[in-house]
Amino acid sequence: LTCLGGFASPGPVPPSTALRELIEELVNITQNQKAPLCNGSMVWSINLTAGMYCAALESLINVSGCSAIEKTQRMLSGFCPHKVSAGQFSSLHVRDTKIEVAQFVKDLLLHLKKLFREGQFN
């Protein structure tokens, strides 16, 4: 999962390839982490179930000025059909737990690796 291999092809990529690329980006972030990721910024935790890509984007988009996760933010927008912007929370419920971006990325990475291996969600 950590090796891209080959050149990026023009046009659409298969969904499994897009997911693999997202996983690879999250791996890069966790491996290259020297100082606290995004200066230890806190984000809302999410449930890793249906709607998690949009929820993850909504959570991470509120972290500004952190170049380390900009690519992840861009990539996640391709997994979510809805327009998500900073400061906008679609949740009607008050999210009750905040965690560090580093932990958020780690949790998301572990879950996506599991999904990629199993090749299923529902």
């Epitope: 298969p14 897009a18 997911l19 998690m52 890509y53 949009c54 009607l92 419920h93 299923q120 529902n122």
Partner: antibody, heavy 123, light 112 residues
Framework: EVQLVQSGAEVKKPGASVKVSCKAS????????VSWVRQAPGQGLEWIGE????????YYNEKFRGKATMTTDTSTSTAYMELRSLRSDDTAVYYC????????????????WGQGTTVTVSS | DVVMTQSPLSLPVTLGQPASISCRSS???????????LHWYQQRPGQSPRLLIY???NRFSGVPDRFSGSGSGTDFTLKISRVEAEDVGVYYC?????????FGGGTKVEIK
């Protein structure tokens, strides 16, 4: 067997509100979204919005923002949609449907539908 | 919003004969990940819509193999190889590549 059972028909006066329910069974409620679609008399289908019970995130068709509010109760596997400031042109059959996504994105399709709830707005 | 245009509006068919419904979208429905989120629903008289085909050509569980979907980009087709009496109703195409998700106006299939 997947089932979505909706509440019964409603007759309301203009300006009133109505809350339609959709009880899900036969699957894990939080691993799918729930969408709402309306069908006015003799008309086609119109997507209102979707809600993800597992994350509580809601997304609306801009046309229905401020008109519809979607909620869920995970303890009873029930989705709700409230319509406010009802007008005669809100008269329609309202359907809930299960929004099936895949493991690799939140894109998907409506795979199972409720029987529909008729809302009539008349003075 | 993406406009979905179906033709014909009405389709009188003879039992046992094939039928074909066309659906055209105002924008390409190909997502950057490669999937095309174009689906077909059947609504029998007095009933709720029912999923027939998802992502262009995948038959949903329990759907008879006389139903098939094809197409790409902006042009899609639903085919019924041999129409049966239970196939009477309105057929809708729908896209979920772009928000808001939209439906075609429907094609009414009736027996001649």
């Amino acid at each position: 067997e997947v089932q979505l059972v909706q509440s019964g028909a409603e007759v309301k006066k203009p300006g009133a509100s109505v809350k339609v329910s959709c009880k899900a069974s036969g699957y894990t409620f939080t691993t799918y979204g729930v969408s709402w679609v309306r069908q006015a008399p003799g008309q086609g289908l119109e997507w209102i919005g979707e809600i993800y019970p597992g994350n509580y995130n809601t997304y609306y068709n801009e046309k229905f923002r401020g008109k519809a509010t979607m909620t869920t109760d995970t303890s009873t596997s029930t989705a709700y949609m409230e319509l406010r400031s009802l007008r005669s042109d809100d008269t329609a059959v309202y359907y809930c449907s299960r929004w099936r996504t895949s493991y690799f994105s939140d894109y998907g399709y409506f795979d199972y539908w409720g029987q529909g709830t008729t809302v009539t707005v008349s003075s | 919003d993406v406009v979905m245009t179906q033709s014909p509006l009405s389709l009188p068919v003879t039992l046992g004969q094939p039928a074909s419904i066309s659906c055209r979208s105002s924008q390409s429905l190909v997502h950057s990940h490669g999937n095309t989120y174009l689906h077909w629903y059947q609504q029998r008289p007095g009933q709720s819509p029912r999923l027939l085909i998802y992502t262009v050509s995948n038959r949903f569980s329990g759907v008879p193999d006389r139903f098939s979907g094809s197409g790409s980009g902006t042009d899609f087709t639903l085919k019924i190889s041999r129409v049966e009496a239970e196939d009477v109703g309105v057929y809708y195409c729908s896209q979920s590549t772009h928000v808001p998700y939209t439906f075609g106006g429907g094609t009414k299939v009736e027996i001649k």
